[in-house]
Interface confidence: low
């Protein structure tokens, strides 16, 4: 004959374990239903009676099968600086994550704890690695042959146009101005955008070294992140 | 009104444990979340960790291996416990409020309990 | 950890000076605030989010920076200004405090 199915509550067999999603309730000595997610224990099993469950209140939740007296709290609404990518529901907590243009300086199990507006690179300066979800952008000075004129957290610095003959030579922070006839080649008409970094856990892969007219001499030059423009912590 | 009250002042034997409660008013603790501070004799300031509103706990790296921080909601206090105390751990302990969802400065400090590491 | 150096340690002031202390951070951080600590006091907060002033400090104070470099200015010392300010930032962890600014009066 096949084994009875014992009915929560009951007495586990010696050195026995409660089946899946009960508990063994010391006081009652007994094994007991769980609640499953979603609810809580209103009252816990006797020797005679099941535990009872209760739904949580609102902004509370219990993702687990579980004999909490209480439903835990869902963290506090998302602050400015964040958008809501998952909702308070009685089985969720909510999930606060950053918003475009910042990253998230201080994680928490689930979502993130702090967000800090990304880096902006100050003109003379380029996006040496573009800012993810959890980490900021890094800067670094344009090597000789290339400039950067934008205050920006995604432009990286771009070659000097090359010219027949120059007006005006260029620099860091800006283009060479080349006399009215046309320039021999213009390498990067356009400021050159990387992506956004969006929300999900993949990394983005470092920029390509921008092409140089000159011997590059970066290795000089300070390769620690920059300060942002003055006035640049975020919008 | 806003309040945090630390209890103390303390005496502490080298080599035992310090618990210190702080206990708030004026606010609900699943809503802020509580750092600890302490300030050694003509000393600066030192962050030593911080409890969260959704109970979760962040520890400075020089103290993670001998400090506790956690929290009854429903009695309003939050309970900080140190092993090991030295000499140098002689300081004033403060317990500060912080908005999880504003600005993340310590906007209310309790007055401190003065904590001497004594033989 | 980010280190933050407030320099000078000591200053002091006469009444009407103007007034500027700064704190350089070893990394670049987001945000820097300010705290205000008066002798056998708890600190209060001074200035958050780098430049905004906290509830019921003066308008003659102010704060400014980006990147690794900030500053807390008062723009008329006044007498009840004398204090010991510390900065803080928490761009990354942990949370960190500079040594302190004292600032007396003349």
């Known amino acids: 004959l096949p084994a009875q199915v014992a009915f929560t509550p009951y007495a586990p067999e010696p050195g026995s374990t409660c089946r899946l999603r009960e508990y063994y309730d010391q006081t009652a000595q007994m094994c007991c239903s769980k609640c499953s997610p979603g609810q809580h224990a209103k009252v816990f099993c006797t020797k005679t009676s099941d535990t009872v469950c209760d739904s949580c209140e609102d902004s509370t939740y219990t993702q687990l099968w579980n004999w909490v007296p209480e439903c835990l709290s869902c963290g506090s609404r998302c602050s400015s600086d964040q958008v809501e990518t998952q909702a308070c529901t009685r089985e969720q907590n909510r999930i606060c994550t950053c918003r475009p243009g910042w990253y998230c300086a201080l994680s928490k199990q689930e979502g993130c704890r702090l967000c800090a507006p990304l880096r902006k690179c100050r003109p003379g300066f380029g996006v040496a690695r573009p800012g993810t979800e959890t980490s900021d952008v890094v800067c670094k000075p344009c090597a000789p042959g290339t400039f950067s004129n934008t205050t920006s957290s995604t432009d990286i610095c771009r070659p000097h146009q090359i010219c027949n003959v120059v007006a005006i030579p260029g620099n860091a922070s800006m283009d060479a101005v080349c006399t009215s006839t046309s320039p021999t080649r213009s390498m990067a008409p356009g400021a050159v955008h990387l992506p956004q970094p969006v929300s999900t856990r993949s990394q983005h892969t470092q920029p390509t070294p921008e092409p140089s007219t000159a011997p590059s001499t970066s290795f000089l030059l300070p390769m620690g992140p920059s300060p942002p423009a003055e006035g640049s912590t975020g919008d | 009104e806003v309040q945090l009250q630390e209890s103390g002042p303390v005496l502490v034997q080298p080599s035992q444990s310090l618990s210190i409660t702080c206990t708030v008013s004026?606010?609900?603790?699943?809503?802020?979340?509580v750092h600890w501070v302490r300030q050694s004799p003509g000393k600066g300031l030192e962050w030593l960790g911080v409890?969260?509103?959704?109970?979760?706990?962040d520890y400075s790296a020089a103290f993670i291996s001998r400090l506790s921080i956690s929290k009854d909601n429903s009695k309003s206090q939050v309970f900080f416990k140190m092993n090991s105390l030295q000499a140098d751990d002689t300081a004033i302990y403060y317990c500060?409020?912080?908005?999880?969802?504003?600005?993340?400065?310590?906007?209310?400090w309790g007055q401190g309990t003065t904590v001497t590491v004594s033989s | 950890e980010i280190v933050l150096t407030q320099s000078p340690a000591l200053m002091s002031a006469s009444p009407g000076e103007k007034v500027t202390m700064t704190c350089s951070a070893s990394?670049?951080?987001?945000?820097m605030y300010w705290y205000q600590q008066k002798p056998r006091s708890s600190p209060k907060p001074w200035i958050y989010?780098?430049?905004n002033l906290a509830s019921g400090v003066p308008a003659r104070f102010s704060g400014s920076g980006s990147g690794t470099s900030y500053s807390l200015t008062i723009s008329s010392m006044e007498a009840e200004d004398a204090a010991t300010y510390y900065c803080?930032?928490?761009?990354?962890?942990?949370?960190?405090f500079g040594a302190g600014t004292k600032l007396e009066i003349k």
């Open positions: 004026g606010f609900s603790l699943t809503s802020y979340s």
């Open positions: 990394s670049s951080v987001s945000y």
């Open positions: 500060a409020r912080n908005d999880d969802g504003g600005d993340y400065a310590m906007d209310y």
């Open positions: 409890i969260w509103s959704d109970g979760g706990t």
């Open positions: 989010l780098t430049s």
């Open positions: 803080q930032q928490w761009s990354s962890n942990p949370l960190t």
